[in-house]
Structure formats: structure tokens, C-alpha cells
């Protein structure tokens, strides 16, 4: 580390005095200090001498000696005060520029350390500092305004008490620049626009920034539009607005509109699409299949997407049957707007009952007319099974009817003993019916199938069981021949058929 002679941190001299500052290092050394007149510099290998024969208040400042070859970058410093009774301040710069929230150093150096107790910072023409101005003072460096704000961009003077009166420095202009985080913020409204040919339309492009220096323009299909600009300042932001008014739109006005704004940080752009149509339109669609199947007791939400211009004048859900004349409860119908021209309508059908199967229609109306979208809702049921014993042309026959949706599959089991359900160990024979005959298959109803098993001779210590299953569940019915006739066992009850 270089060494300065005299080896004191501060040196106080009078104007006109001779000052010699000597710096000695291991290698070559360099001096750095405030730009001031009358200094002469003499270098001799590893030492450098800075001297003046006529010190003035302008020589007040901190002089630092560095050794460029030192890898540790060590330095030594001495602060020189040239105390001029007429000049308490040495101002190193008359303009200071910082960004908001940085510390701003106003470099008015006190020429006499004794005056430190009576210093203050004021605005020019004796005006007090703005409220919330947080500052500190260093006799070596000057006044520091901490976390400077844009509003603190003012002309300041440093004040010192000398013999009971305040002596001011020359003024220092502080410029606090807004931190521009990026390109200007943009809004382009509306985000989407539809008009019928001949109608009026308005597109507004606006940009705002903390700094006034930015440009904004509106373009249509890559052509820049000449639109007068309105400017404003509020909420600490500069705003520039371009408004495109079209009295009677035509097809050539349709297309892509881009709002573009730029500043030193870069460019922002946002776009919207303007659609010009010949007449009103109303389109209904659903992402769901229009044919729905749900298990009885479960819930379902029917959703319809509506695209319309102009807006809807009416809409409703209607139940078209076939089971009853009930209508969907309004509280179960829900509407949400996705954007100006698209809406979603939902009908909630919780805990579906058999009578709620059928057709549900969503109807909507606008000046373009009525449109409807119809869902067909079929309920799924687990099979219900029943078996009867009958004679046809003298042949004994077991008839199994199974009712459910989807269409049930039918299996016959013949097993030993009397039981209401054949288990694997008892099974003597199994017949899977590949083609049970459909007895009824009405839309929205259960499908009823019938399977016929001819029985040449009834074995009395055996059970015939008809089982039916589908994707929802299964059901069964056991038939037990006895000498007096026949017993049939439904799943949960006992029935006697003579």
C-alpha cells in the first residue's frame, strides 16, 4: 500500500499556502483528486509529488494515491481543506443525474471543517426541502439525498453558518430520472370486434410510461394509420391515446389491428381482430357428444357454446320429453361469458331420475333468429331379471326376461341343489345366450330381452338360474322346480308360482 506524506488523514491550510503531497510506493504511483488549478505533478520512479505554491478553496478535496501494479489495488488518501473565510464551499459539479431510488451525492465540499456543525441543504431561493427528503452530510463529500425521487429533481444550495449568517454555495441541479422498466404498457380495446356492415365501430390504442419519451401508433394489416394523438398524465404516468372511429364499417375495414409503442427500452405491440359480417349470426355448438349416456342416480352437466352477434335477446333450456312435461329448474341453468361474442350455457342435472331421460334442447335468440341444440340423454340401468316356467306345445320352457340399459347379456346356469344363487361348485351346465331376443327397445327406455331355455325333464333337486349383466351391473333370478309346481327366487325375495 502506498504511503502519503504528510501522514495525516486531513490537512488544513489557508489560501495562498504552499502544499506538497508526496506519495511513495513499491512501484510507480498515481494521484487522483478533484479537478482544480495550480497543481504541479512531479514523478520520480516509485514516488510522486503533487504541489502548489498558491492553494485556493478550489483545491479542497480528497487526494488519493494508488499503485496501479498492486494486485490488491491498495490506495492511500488525504483530505485537504483550504479554508477561505469568503468561500465555505467548493462545488465539484453543478449538475447531478441519478435514477429514482438511487442515492444522489451533491458534491459541495466544506472548505473549513470547523463549519460542519452549521451546515444545511436548501433549495434555491431559500426554499425548504420537500417533505420526506432524507439526506446526510459528509464534510469530505457533500450532501447525499437518499433514495432520490423523481419529484426531488430541483436546484439545491449548500448552506453554512459563518459569523451568524448563512453563506450559500453555487447551485447544484439534481436530475432524478424515472427508471424505465421496459417498453411502454399497452392497451388495445376491444380485444375482439365484430360489426355488421354499415354499423359504427371504435378501436382505441393507448400506451403509457413513466417517461414521456415514447412513440405509439396503430396499424391495420401492416399499414400505419394517421390518427391524431391525445396525451395525458395521471397516476405518475404519461399516456398517449389513439382513437379510430369508423362511422360505417365495410369489409375493407376488417382485419388485424396492431397497437405498437416504443421507447429506449424497446418495443411492445398487441393485436386484435376486427370482423365485418354481412348480417347477424348465432351459432350453437357443444364439445360434448349430443348423445349422452349416464347411469341412473348420477349427475350430468350439459354445456352449450354460443357464438353470436349482436348479443342474445333470449335463451332457455327445454325438456322435450318423452317422460313428463317437467321443465329444467332455472336455478340449475348457468351462463358464463367467455368474451364479448362467446358464451357458455350449462344445465346441471344432478342425481338423474328415470323420468329425466330424454331430449334436452337449448334455444337462443338474437336478431339473426332462433337456434336450437338438442341433447339426447339415455339413462343406464343395471339389469332386472325375472323367470317364468311355461309349457309351449307340450314342451317345458323357462323364459327369462332381463331389463336394463345397455342391453343385458343373458346366461343360464343349471346347478345341483336348491339355491337362490348357483355357486361354481354346484354348476352342472352353463348356457351363454349369444342372441337373447329383444322384446322392447324404445328410445330412452330400458331394453328388455328374453331368453328361452327348453327343459325336457325338470330335475327336482336342481336349480335353474338366469343371470343378466351389462356395463352397469348384474341381476339374477333362480328357478327351483318342486313337485307341487315351481318356485322362483328373485334376488332378494321369495315368490311362488303354481
Amino acid at each position: 500500500i502506498p504511503v502519503i506524506e504528510p501522514s495525516v488523514p486531513e490537512l488544513v491550510v489557508k489560501p495562498g499556502a504552499t502544499v506538497t503531497l508526496r506519495c511513495v510506493g513499491n512501484g510507480s504511483v498515481e494521484w487522483d483528486g478533484p479537478p482544480s488549478p495550480h497543481w504541479t505533478l512531479y514523478s520520480d520512479g516509485s514516488s510522486s509529488i503533487l504541489s502548489t505554491n498558491n492553494a485556493t478553496f478550489q483545491n479542497t478535496g480528497t487526494y488519493r494515491c494508488t499503485e496501479p501494479g498492486d494486485p490488491l489495488g491498495g490506495s492511500a488518501a488525504i483530505h485537504l481543506y483550504v479554508k477561505d473565510p469568503a468561500r465555505p464551499w467548493n462545488v465539484l459539479a453543478q449538475e447531478v443525474v441519478v435514477f429514482e431510488d438511487q442515492d444522489a451525492l451533491l458534491p459541495c465540499l466544506l472548505t473549513d471543517p470547523v463549519l460542519e456543525a452549521g451546515v444545511s441543504l436548501v433549495r434555491v431561493r431559500g426554499r425548504p426541502l420537500m417533505r420526506h427528503t432524507n439526506y446526510s452530510f459528509s464534510p469530505w463529500h457533500g450532501f447525499t439525498i437518499h433514495r432520490a425521487k423523481f419529484i426531488q429533481s430541483q436546484d439545491y444550495q449548500c448552506s453554512a453558518l459563518m459569523g451568524g449568517r448563512k453563506v450559500m454555495s453555487i447551485s447544484i441541479r439534481l436530475k432524478v430520472q424515472k427508471v424505465i422498466p421496459g417498453p411502454p404498457a399497452l392497451t388495445l380495446v376491444p380485444a375482439e370486434l365484430v360489426r355488421i356492415r354499415g354499423e359504427a365501430a371504435q378501436i382505441v390504442c393507448s400506451a403509457s410510461s413513466v417517461d414521456v419519451n415514447f412513440d405509439v401508433f396503430l396499424q391495420h394489416n401492416n399499414t400505419k394509420l394517421a390518427i391524431p394523438q391525445q396525451s395525458d398524465f395521471h397516476n405518475n404516468r404519461y399516456q398517449k391515446v389513439l382513437t379510430l372511429n369508423l362511422d360505417q364499417v365495410d369489409f375493407q375495414h376488417a382485419g388485424n389491428y396492431s397497437c405498437v409503442a416504443s421507447n429506449v427500452q424497446g418495443k411492445h405491440s398487441t393485436s386484435m381482430f376486427f370482423r365485418v359480417v354481412e348480417s347477424a349470426y348465432l351459432n350453437l355448438s357443444s364439445e360434448q357428444n349430443l348423445i349422452q349416456e349416464v347411469t341412473v342416480g348420477e349427475g350430468l352437466n350439459l354445456k352449450v357454446m354460443v357464438e353470436a352477434y349482436p348479443g342474445l335477446q333470449g335463451f332457455n333450456w327445454t325438456y322435450l320429453g318423452p317422460f313428463s312435461d317437467h321443465q329444467p329448474e332455472p336455478k340449475l341453468a348457468n351462463a358464463t361469458t367467455k368474451d364479448t361474442y362467446r358464451h357458455t350455457f350449462t344445465l346441471s342435472l344432478p342425481r338423474l331420475k328415470p323420468s329425466e331421460a330424454g331430449r334436452y334442447s337449448f334455444l337462443a335468440r338474437n336478431p339473426g333468429g332462433w337456434r336450437a341444440l338438442t341433447f339426447e340423454l339415455t339413462l343406464r340401468y343395471p339389469p332386472e331379471v325375472s323367470v317364468i316356467w311355461t309349457f309351449i306345445n307340450g314342451s317345458g320352457t323357462l323364459l327369462c326376461a332381463a331389463s336394463g340399459y345397455p342391453q343385458p347379456n343373458v346366461t343360464w346356469l343349471q346347478c345341483s341343489g336348491h339355491t337362490d344363487r348357483c355357486d361354481e361348485a354346484q354348476v352342472l351346465q352353463v348356457w351363454d345366450d349369444p342372441y337373447p331376443e329383444v322384446l322392447s327397445q324404445e328410445p330412452f327406455h330400458k331394453v328388455t330381452v328374453q331368453s328361452l331355455l327348453t327343459v325336457e325333464t325338470l330335475e327336482h333337486n336342481q336349480t335353474y338360474e338366469c343371470r343378466a349383466h351389462n356395463s352397469v351391473g348384474s341381476g339374477s333370478w333362480a328357478f327351483i322346480p318342486i313337485s307341487a309346481g315351481a318356485h322362483t327366487h328373485p334376488p332378494d325375495e321369495f315368490l311362488f308360482t303354481p
Epitope: 306345445n393 320352457t397 331376443e437 331368453s451 331355455l453
Partner: antibody
Amino acid sequence: QVQLKQSGPGLVQPSQSLSITCTVSGFSLTTYGINWVRLSPGKGLEWLGMIWRGGNTDYNAAFMSRLTITKDNSKNHVFFQLNSLQPDDTAIYFCAKSGGLRLYYAMDYWGQGTSVTVSS
Amino acid sequence: DVVMTQPPLSLPVSLGDQASISCRSSQSLVHSNGNTYLHWYLQKPGQSPKLLIYKVSNRLSGVPDRFSGSGSGTDFTLKISRVEAEDLGVYFCSQSSHVPWTFGGGTKLEIR
């Protein structure tokens, strides 16, 4: 015992219809279905369709537009009608009883066959 | 439609020999309920076809036990362990797993 007797013409003009009646005995048409099958030198045996015991019908899609099968349970009659005949419809036409679930609907009894020639 | 193929068209055998008649389907004959509905018929000269075997391997009542059926999926075989004179005729395989039901072209069993 089970019997199926067929009655119908032997010669049919092109574009005309073929009608065959199958009269059954020894079982009930309410218990068993009836199939119709034909045998021709060029195509071998072809299943044309059937009428189930409950009256439902299943047709081979190749003949659906011109085939009708009906029945009269009380008279034990099954009726077969094939429209718009062409020379390649020349074949022996059989009615055959479905064996029911115990035989998995395989055809356990057949009629004697009706030999049909389509020619002008 | 399921195509049933029966090679060969003619199968010459000596009486008392074993005969094997094959049948192949263009797709699996397993029905959605898991069963395979493949049947065998015999048509003797001047007669109507008669059912011999149903559901791959079940002999119809009255059919001699020298007739047996086997196979699964798409490949099926009818075996006659000792051919007798009354066995001569055309053998047809048939499926009722998928509508429309279809028949093979037939294999004629004749004396060598």
C-alpha cells in the same frame, strides 16, 4: 317328430319375386326361430336371414333391401319373399329350424329345399 | 362379413381311415360373451344338410362318437376317426358368432 316342408315355384322370371312357404310341425314357432339358407354352385351355402321366435328378423345385409321374412304362428307357416331376382339367384333355397339356446342357434332340422331357376 | 375357408375342395379317403377336415375363419370367432359358435354340417348327395357338431366340439344327439370337433380362434378341425360309407358327402363349417352367419365352401369326402 320335427318336420319342415317347403312349397314354392321352380322357375322365376328375371326381375320377378320368389315366394316360398315353410310349414313346420313337431315344434312351435313361438319356441324356435327359422333360418333361410341357399345353396348355389358358384357361392356354396349362403345364410339369407332368419325370423326369431318372437317375430324379430335378422337379414344378411347383402339381401336386406329385397328380402322379407314373416310368419303365422297359429298356422305354423313361415313366409320367404325375395324380390328382383336375377339369374345369379338361381339356387336351392332351404328353410332350417334354429336349435335354440341349447344348440346355440345351430340349425338342427332343414326343409327338403326348393330348387329355383331364374330364367326368361 | 366373416369369410370361412375350407381347403381342400375334395378329400379322398379309404374306408376305415381317419379323415381330418379343416376350416379357417377370416377373423376370430370368439363372441363378445367369450364363447365360440362354430358348427359342422354334412350334406349327403340328394339330401338337405344335417347338423353334426355345434359350438366347436359338442356332438348333436344321435351323431356317432367317431366324429369330433376341435379348434379355437380362427382354426378349427373336424375329425372322423374311422370313415364309413355313410359318412361320404360334403362337410360345411359355419359360424354364428357374428351376423351375418356364414358357411365355408365345403369339403367333399369321397372314396379314394
